[in-house]
Each structure stands twice: as C-alpha cells, then as structure tokens.
C-alpha cells in the first residue's frame, strides 16, 4: 500500500521530494500525526510529512511527474516526484523539467526550432489522433505547458506570461494560473508594498499595459493607507 511504502526504512533519509523539502533535509515520511517511526531498535519521532499521492502525471505540479518512489517498486504506489533536469535519464516527457523533453532516454532542451515537429510525432505515436479525452488537465499529453503550443487565449491555463497571447498575462486564479487581460488606463491595479507579496493573492491581476504605471488614484490621497485605490495611469 501507499502507506507501507511511505513508512518503510527504504525511504527514510532520501533528499526532497521523498525525505523532506526545503528546510526539512532528510526528514522521514510519517503516516499519521505524531506517529513514531521504527528506526533501528528504538522508535523515534519524525516530521509530519507526507508526499503528494498520484495516479497520473496530471495530478502533480507542472515541475513534477508521477512515479513509484522506489526503483522497480509497487506500481500501485505512486507519488509526485521532482522533475528531472537536462541530461538526466527519463522514460517519458513528463519526467523532464519544463523547457526540456525526453529524447532517447535523456532529458534534452526543447529548442523550439527542431522540437515541435518531433514532439508532435511522438504524441501522435503514443496517443494517436483521438483528442476526445482532452480536458483542462491533459497538459502532459498535448502541446501545452511543458511542450510548445499556440499562445493561450483569455481564460486558458498557463504557467508564465509567455504562454499567453499578446495583451494577456499569466495570473493566479483560484487553484490555477490563467491568461488574463493586461490592465488598461484607469483600471484598478495592485501595488505590492513588498517584494513577493503578490504570491498571497488568490485573484491576481495583470500588470499595467505599456506606458502605464500603477499609482494611487489622485482623489484617494487622503484615504487611509489600507483603503488607497491604485489605478493604471500614464507615466
């Protein structure tokens, strides 16, 4: 079972993503809050960490793939593993980090010039031409996210603004990031007080368009700091 693998000594001290993550080097995997881990002859308390479970690549983050945590392990026990960087071994495209693809068992850079035709061939071979099963999550088996594709229209799922068509940016919306319109003059914008604070937004706005900047609306100067309204204004 998933839990027996997660509790086995075999994965106790692996690096991320199995044995821990940033700030948790070598932490073991636990099966329940506060549970004790059988290490050697005595039990020891361990970090309350559990890898993300999955059955397919689409259930993992865009820079992860779904696989068994142990080589030749139980095929039914799978977790999300960190993607493989350039020149690392691979068995399929999803194993390679964004910007790379799997060629002859090695992750190689997806140079757009030669990559597109080659990847389309592979997809046709592997999945045929039946696109009836495509949905918003089929990003590993179609030309999206990891693979070159037509620029996303408004509302399309994206990873970065370069995935979106002209006049759109990639911004967070609920659980995903989608292409949203770049803000026009007079539209309300978000001014980030400190670097990185945009990461806390649930409905992220795009940036202001060319020649515009996000500034306090003139008639709102007297308002309190927290209620100041920012809009896109000409430089």
């Amino acid at each position: 079972t998933l839990n027996s693998v997660l509790n086995s000594n075999a994965i106790k001290n692996l690096p991320p993503p199995l044995g821990g993550a940033a700030g948790h080097p070598g932490s073991a995997v636990s099966a329940a809050p506060g549970i004790l881990y059988p290490g050697g002859n005595k039990y020891q308390t361990i970090d309350n960490y559990q890898p993300y479970p999955c059955a397919e690549d689409e259930e993992c983050g865009t820079d992860e793939y779904c696989a068994s945590p142990t080589r030749g392990g139980d095929a039914g026990v799978q977790i999300c593993l960190a993607c493989r960087k350039r020149r690392k071994r691979c068995m399929r495209h999803a194993m390679c980090c964004p910007g790379n693809y799997c060629k002859n068992g090695i992750c190689v850079s997806s140079d757009q010039n030669h990559f597109r035709g080659e990847i389309e061939e592979t997809i046709t071979e592997s999945f045929g031409n039946d696109h009836s099963t495509l949905d918003g999550y089929s990003r590993r088996t179609t030309l999206s996210s990891k693979m070159y594709h037509t620029k996303g229209q408004e509302g399309s799922v994206c990873l970065r603004s370069s995935d979106c068509a002209s006049g759109l940016c990639c911004a967070r919306h609920f659980w995903s990031k989608i292409c949203k319109p770049v803000l026009k003059e007079g539209q309300v914008c978000t001014k980030h007080r400190r670097k990185g604070s945009h990461g806390l937004e649930i409905f992220q706005r795009c940036y202001c368009g060319e020649g515009l900047s996000c500034r306090i609306q003139k008639d709102h100067h007297q308002a309190s700091n927290s209620s100041r309204l920012h809009t896109c204004q000409r430089h």
Partner: nanobody
C-alpha cells in the same frame, strides 16, 4: 503559523452524504496543495483526496465517483463532499495543507461515523 480546522463530521446512515470543511488560517499560497486523509481505529492513515495548484484532483480508488474535493480560496477553505457513504468510510478525517513536495500541516480531525 498554519492552522487547519475541520468541521462537518458526524453520524450518518449508509448511503447518506456529508460535507466536510477545512478552514485554513495563517495560510499562504506557498502551500499549494490541500488534501483529505482518514484514519480508522487500529489502521494507518490513508489518503482520501488531494488537490494541487493547476492540476487534476487525486482520489483514492475506494472513494472515486463518491467523494469530491474542492476549495474556495476566497474563504481559504477546502471541502470534501462525501456521497453514498459506506460503513467502511467510518474514520477520523484530517485536512492537510501542502508545501513544495508534500503535506506538512494537519488539522485535528473530525469524526465521521457511518452506521444504521
């Protein structure tokens, strides 16, 4: 510090439905996974459902087609809609919030009892 508080558990008859809620505070979008796990008496904790940013939800085989995981980020709340409940679904249900590679933060749990 992240705090997760589950609610919505209780006693329900077989075939019935329940909706569990998990309210998160101190929650930042660095935590880009939310999940539901359960632990029946004398058994190991097992995953029920899990959802990641920009990804398809994961469901354990035993709950596929019966349970649905969702989230309302404006309320910082995750949900588990449980339909067609069976006696074997009886357990303490835990909500979890995940970081980069897995789940780190856990709620205290809410008891779900399926019995006639």
């Amino acid at each position: 510090e992240v705090q997760l508080v589950e609610s919505g558990g209780g006693l329900v008859q077989p075939g019935g439905s329940l909706r569990l809620s998990c309210a998160a505070s101190g929650f930042s979008l660095d935590y880009y996974g939310m999940g539901w796990f359960r632990q029946a008496p004398g058994k190991e904790r097992e995953v029920v459902a899990s959802i990641r940013w920009n990804a398809k939800p994961y469901y354990a085989d035993s709950v596929k087609g019966r349970f649905t995981i969702s989230a309302d980020n404006s309320k910082n709340t995750a949900y588990l809609q449980m339909n067609s409940l069976k006696p074997e679904d009886t357990a303490v249900y835990y909500c979890a919030a995940g970081k980069r590679y897995g789940y780190y933060d856990w709620g205290q749990g809410t008891l779900v009892t399926v019995s006639s």
